[in-house]
């Protein structure tokens, strides 16, 4: 059974993941550049279901494409360093989903833009944090 300290740690990690995703989305929303149009042409796979921590496998599998798209945005007004950022997110995701069980991610038929993708995973974090609070 999860202890209060393990729940607290999970909540803290989810809050970190949530903030990182919100930071990316804010950077993109603030981005006034022709590159933004190009960024929005990239398609991301969305999870068919995302209600449990194990479903973070679906996010993990999309982190490399996410880093590649964010690399397009590099400028003096885009303050997120994609390599550091994605590395940080990856560490959090691995800790949250655990590595004991292998979960095969199922993706939805429809792909999504980077904004839709980020919003989906932000909502995921928020809903799980809400159940822990």
């Amino acid at each position: 059974a999860p202890t209060s300290s393990s729940t607290k740690k999970t909540q803290l990690q989810l809050e970190h993941l949530l903030l990182d995703l919100q930071m990316i989305l804010n950077g993109i929303n603030n981005y006034k550049n022709p590159k933004l149009t190009r960024m929005l042409t990239f398609k991301f796979y969305m999870p068919k279901k995302a209600t449990e921590l194990k479903h973070l496998q679906c996010l993990e599998e999309e982190l490399k494409p996410l880093e590649e798209v964010l690399n397009l945005a590099q400028s003096k007004n885009f303050h997120l360093r994609p390599r550091d950022l994605i590395s940080n997110i990856n560490v959090i995701v691995l800790e949250l989903k655990g590595s004991e069980t292998t979960f095969m991610c199922e993706y939805a038929d429809e792909t999504a833009t980077i904004v839709e993708f980020l919003n989906r995973w932000i909502t995921f974090c928020q809903s799980i944090i809400s159940t822990l609070t």
């Epitope: 809050e15 970190h16 903030l19 919100q22 930071m23 989305l25 804010n26 303050h79 590395s87 932000i122």
Partner: antibody, heavy 113, light 107 residues
């Protein structure tokens, strides 16, 4: 106990820059992201941005983008907020806040010629 | 950006009164809302987080309710130390935004 201690009041001329520090103690510095919020005299609260204390990357409110820089020094558990090209409207109390629940005492920055 | 609108902007009340302050978000923010109290010359103090959770050390006369777009802060029995300005704040999405504040004054 958990505490954020900010640097002292500053008086600056228009066009100058100001750098405010915020030293954290009483908790694991990298556990909570640091926000900066400002409050002009007699006005409400305005969010400026956030920094991830572990990795150092930042995200700013659009209004401040290009003028604000947030940095951190993990060795001293200190976060910095630098605002450049100051104008009279930047006269305000600047707060750092860890996780939005613990706040620094505030730093008054006055911009006047 | 999500706009947060508080009402009233100020109110006069007496010690012992029940005081209610409302906050409306321009779009649904679920329960990602906090309430702060600020006294002159001091930093804001967190009272309520997650719309209805009482921050540790905050008196139980303070309570929060609501979800979606409409939220309420209630002080069940106003005490002398409660005269201050109160702000709501959403953290549902960046940029984080605050209400314009409600000043609670002595009648």
């Amino acid at each position: 106990q958990v505490q954020l201690v900010q640097s002292g009041a500053e008086v600056k001329k228009p066009g100058a820059s100001v750098k405010v520090s915020c030293k954290a103690s009483g908790y694991t510095f990298t556990d909570y992201y640091m926000h900066w919020v400002r409050q002009a005299p007699g006005q409400g609260l305005e969010w400026m941005g956030i920094i991830n204390p572990r990795a150092g990357y930042t995200s700013y409110a659009l209004k401040f983008q290009g003028r604000v820089t947030m940095t951190r020094d993990t060795s001293t558990s200190t976060v910095y907020m630098e605002l450049s090209s100051l104008r009279s409207e930047d006269t305000a109390v600047y707060y750092c806040t860890s996780g939005m629940d613990v706040w620094g005492q505030g730093t008054l920055v006055t911009v006047s010629s | 950006d999500i706009q947060m609108t508080q009402s009233p902007s100020s109110l006069s009340a007496s010690v012992g009164d029940r005081v209610t302050i409302t906050c409306r978000a321009s779009q649904s923010i679920s329960t990602w809302l906090a309430w702060y109290q600020q006294k002159p010359g001091k930093a804001p103090k967190l009272l309520i987080y997650a719309a209805s959770s009482l921050q540790s050390g905050v008196p139980s006369r303070f309570s929060g309710s609501g979800s979606g777009t409409d939220f309420t802060l209630t002080i069940s029995s106003l005490q002398p130390e409660d005269f201050a300005t109160y702000y709501c704040q959403q953290s549902y999405s960046f940029p984080v935004t605050f209400g314009q504040g409600t000043k609670v004054e002595i009648k």
